[in-house]
């Protein structure tokens, strides 16, 4: 009955502050409408980073001002979070909800620890 959600344990953001990871869910049924939410857990506090609802076979659409982008393929969602800084290092949890058709299922991943290292400022150069 429970829906399993898998995501990588650790991801390192690149020098531009972008981190990508795959969120994969084992669907107990044939869902046509899915909602994916990225949550950040820090000091036992959970906050929403971004969310998107999509129809199976269609693209994920995040809000225009979202720091997330993503694509879906079957039961896999490829998520990218942009604009990260060192202070954003933390555990990012993928939550998947099968909204339609019934029954509703919710699945929560164990979280991906994203490490963000702010780039060193470039030294002044005479060239």
């Amino acid at each position: 009955k429970a829906m399993h959600v898998a995501q990588p344990a650790v991801v390192l953001a690149n020098s531009r502050g972008t981190a990508s990871f795959v969120c994969e869910y084992a669907s107990p049924g044939k869902a046509t409408e899915v909602r994916v939410t990225v949550l950040r857990q820090a000091d036992s506090q959970v906050t929403e980073v971004c969310a998107a609802t999509y129809m199976m076979g269609n693209e994920l659409t995040f809000l225009d001002d979202s720091i997330c982008t993503g694509t879906s393929s079957g039961n896999q969602v490829n998520l990218t979070i942009q604009g990260l800084r060192a202070m954003d290092t933390g555990l990012y949890i993928c939550k998947v909800e099968l909204m339609y058709p019934p029954p509703y299922y919710m699945g929560i991943g164990n979280g991906t620890q994203i490490y963000v290292i702010d780039p060193e400022p470039c030294p002044d150069s005479d060239f």
């Epitope: 009955k1 429970a2 829906m3 399993h4 107990p28 409408e33 909602r35 939410t37 949550l39 959970v46 906050t47 929403e48 969310a51 609802t53 949890i93 939550k95 909800e97 909204m99 339609y100 019934p102 029954p103 509703y104 299922y105 919710m106 699945g107 929560i108």
Partner: antibody, heavy 118, light 108 residues
């Protein structure tokens, strides 16, 4: 501070109708799914209905299916439960509850009492 | 629907006692999707434990949850006077959302 305040309960005759409201404040209402849960006098908790973020997806307990309708108005931060064809066994305190990020019902209203009796 | 059965249905205990309540599910429930609530007379239910183990904000450390699969446990390590109430387990992983029938903790 998160607050959920129910209203609309009261005494109604069998076969009658009632509309419950739940006014939400202190959080971004449209970012959360919501539920109605009821508790008959001296009994346990019974889940009644669920509504998705945008109101497009709704689920009901078998005991109320076809008689109750859940809805929401995100512009007014309000959740509703339209109850038709009421029966004596629908007598209960009705609570609205917010779904927390990780699934459980993290905030509950104070409840509103619905009494179905002739 | 997943049925949840709590045991015992009621118990009498004294302040300082260790209390254990069990919740058995009719089918597999992932530990991420099992919650516990407490309800004091005349009040709304209050979230105690979510994800089988995690304490909700502001819940004292004397409350702890454990278990997996189909059997889950709520433990109060040292019962306080304010803990006399009714306790419910709930599964929130799939519809229909279901609650246990409740366990009433009374003063001995």
């Amino acid at each position: 501070e998160v607050q959920l305040v129910e209203s609309g309960g009261g005494l109604v005759q069998p076969g009658g109708s009632l509309r419950l409201s739940c006014a939400a404040s202190g959080f971004t209402f449209s970012h959360y799914t919501m539920h109605w849960v009821r508790q008959a006098p001296g009994k346990g908790l019974e889940w009644v209905s669920f509504i998705s973020y945008d109101g497009n997806n709704k689920y009901y307990a078998d005991s109320v299916k076809g008689r109750f309708t859940i809805s929401r108005d995100n512009s007014k931060n309000t959740l509703y439960l339209q109850m038709n064809s009421l029966r004596a066994e629908d007598t209960a305190v009705y609570y609205c509850a917010r779904t927390g990020w990780l699934g459980p019902f993290d905030y509950w209203g104070q409840g509103t009492l619905v009494t179905v009796s002739s | 629907a997943i049925q949840l059965t709590q045991s015992p249905s009621s118990l009498s205990a004294s302040v300082g006692d260790r209390v254990t309540i069990t919740c058995r599910a009719s089918q597999y429930v992932g530990s991420s999707y099992l919650a516990w609530y407490l309800q004091k007379p005349g009040q709304s239910p209050q979230l105690l434990i979510y994800g089988a183990f995690s304490r909700a904000t502001g819940i004292p450390a004397r409350f702890s949850g454990s278990g997996s699969g189909t059997e889950f446990t709520l433990t109060i390590s040292s019962l306080q006077s304010e803990d006399f109430a009714v306790y419910y387990c709930q599964q929130d992983g799939s519809s229909p959302w279901t609650f246990g029938q409740g366990t009433k903790v009374e003063i001995k």
